[in-house]
Every structure is written in structure tokens, then in C-alpha cells.
Amino acid sequence: LADPLDHRDAGDLWVPGESESFEDAHVEHSISRSLLEGEIPFPPTS
């Protein structure tokens, strides 16, 4: 399944002084997501 939360569409949202963290892209940059297979605590959200 394609992941609608893929971080690549976030663009360069971070600028100095900006307080929001890439719209919460932690899941896309998590250890779990990096494994890509097996049991992952952060499965792709449909």
C-alpha cells in the first residue's frame, strides 16, 4: 500500500523560528519504517 503520509510531500516546511515539526513526520523517519518489513510499531496508515 502506498503511504499517504510519505514525508517527501512535506517539502521544506522547516524554517528558523517555525515551531511545527514537518507535520509530525517522525513516523516516516522512524526505526520501524526504516525496516520496511516484519513487525513494525508504525505500520503505514491507510
Epitope: 503520509l5 522547516w14 515551531s19 511545527e20 515539526s21 507535520e23 509530525d24 517522525h26 513516523v27 523517519h29 522512524s30 526505526i31 520501524s32 526504516s34 525496516l35 520496511l36 510499531p41 508504525f42 496508515t45
Partner: antibody, heavy 114, light 112 residues
Framework: EVQLVETGGSLVQPGGSLKLTCATS????????LHWIRRSPEKQLEWVAQ??????????YYAESVKGRFIVSRDDSKTTIYLQMNNLKEEDTAIYYC?????WGQGVMVTVSS | DVVLTQAPLSVSVTPGESASISCRSS???????????LYWYLQKPGMSPHLLIY???NLASGIPDRFSGSGSETDFTLKISEVEPEDVGVYYC?????????FGAGTKLELK
């Protein structure tokens, strides 16, 4: 098996320095954002620092309480992150965890006391 | 800073009964993409925290479905439908949307 192993904790005097190391294994490291989070003796969790990936120019972010004193860094070739802690204060006493927010290390104790 | 206020600070539950923990945020944690950046962790005695719920209502892998997360933009609830002895520990809510990232003060769950 995913592993995050923190080392380098000890007893240090106020004003002293310490460098924590978090050696990781079991996952592709380079694109992962990693954090240091600490748990105080009062059992409060406090986010300390974050380091993003090479694709994010290794951007770093800090809690106000440690800004200018702590430096987070990473070595992708060693799949390791670090926390250089300078000018330590008694209120820095805590268990320090390395985490990707999903997986956590076992933690390492840092005690700042004279 | 975003303040996360948890209630109660401690709860005593009979095994098999349900328990609910509340977490209130001082600001909305809803992003423009419809993601709610509210996470729940359990720290068992002598252990590291481990993830239960991410993005308000998503169950982390390996976590039994006795656990569920719900809420709005600022008010969140973790529910444990049938408490088991292994559920004892301190529960924390956290937000990873706004720097600095912050945690609630924790709710200690004990067994009656």
C-alpha cells in the same frame, strides 16, 4: 534485532563534561531521526535533543534547558549518535535514553553532584 | 511550550476492570494533514518507555487491542479495556509536533 545501547554515564561534578554514546544496530540507520530523552529522579520525562538525517542536513534541535551546553551529533558510518554534555548542572541528573520514539535504549544514568 | 496535563496522577484498578487516563493539551495537536500528534507510552518498573499508541489512535505493533486511544484536537484518552497485571507502570502522553517536544507528568497504574 533492533538495538540501541547507551554508554558513558557516570557521576560528575557541577560544571563538568560528559559524552554519551548510543550505538545502534539492526536497522537501516541513515534516514532515521533520533533523539535523546531523559527521565528525572522525579520520574518526569523530558525531551533533550533531536538529530535528523543527512537528507535533512543533520538538523539539530534542543530543549531550552540544554541549549548552548549540549551538542547532539551522529556518525552514520558507525550507526551511532552522541550527546556531548558541557557545563553540567545538578538538574541534569537523570536517566538518558536514546530513542527513535518507537524503539528505546535501556538508558544510562548521569548524576551531577558535588 | 505545549503543556500536557494528565489525570489522574495515579489509579488503582482491579484486574479485569477497565481504566481510562486523560491527557489535555494546551494547544491543538491536529496538523493541516489531519494527523493528531499525540502519543502514549508505558514505562514499566525498571524498564525503558515503550510505545503503545501513536498519532492519537493508532495501535503500535505488538500492543494488545485492550489498549485504545481516542480524542479531539486537545483532549485525549487512553483506555485499557481489561487491565492485566503486566499493565502496571507509569503511562505518559507526549506530543511531537511543536518544539520543544513535551510529555505529561505521568499516570501511575497500580493493581488493587
Amino acid at each position: 534485532e533492533v538495538q540501541l545501547v547507551e554508554t558513558g554515564g557516570s557521576l560528575v561534578q557541577p560544571g563538568g563534561s560528559l559524552k554519551l554514546t548510543c550505538a545502534t544496530s539492526g536497522f537501516p540507520f541513515s534516514n532515521v531521526w533520533l533523539h535523546w530523552i531523559r527521565r528525572s529522579p522525579e520520574k518526569q520525562l523530558e525531551w533533550v535533543a533531536q538529530i535528523k538525517a543527512r537528507s535533512d542536513n543533520y538538523a539539530t534541535y534542543y530543549a531550552e534547558s540544554v541549549k548552548g551546553r549540549f551538542i547532539v551529533s551522529r556518525d552514520d558510518s558507525k550507526t551511532t549518535i552522541y550527546l556531548q554534555m558541557n557545563n553540567l548542572k545538578e538538574e541534569d541528573t537523570a536517566i538518558y535514553y536514546c530513542t527513535g520514539l518507537d524503539y528505546w535504549g535501556q538508558g544510562v544514568m548521569v548524576t551531577v553532584s558535588s | 511550550d505545549v503543556v500536557l496535563t494528565q489525570a489522574p496522577l495515579s489509579v488503582s484498578v482491579t484486574p479485569g476492570e477497565s481504566a481510562s487516563i486523560s491527557c489535555r493539551s494546551s494547544r491543538s495537536l491536529l496538523t493541516s494533514k489531519g494527523i493528531t500528534s499525540l502519543y502514549w507510552y508505558l514505562q514499566k518498573p525498571g524498564m525503558s518507555p515503550h510505545l503503545l499508541i501513536y498519532r492519537m489512535s493508532n495501535l503500535a505493533s505488538g500492543i494488545p487491542d485492550r489498549f485504545s486511544g481516542s480524542g479531539s484536537e486537545t483532549d485525549f484518552t487512553l483506555k485499557i479495556s481489561e487491565v492485566e497485571p503486566e499493565d502496571v507502570g507509569v503511562y505518559y502522553c507526549a506530543q511531537f509536533l511543536v518544539y520543544p517536544y513535551t510529555f505529561g507528568a505521568g499516570t501511575k497504574l497500580e493493581l488493587k
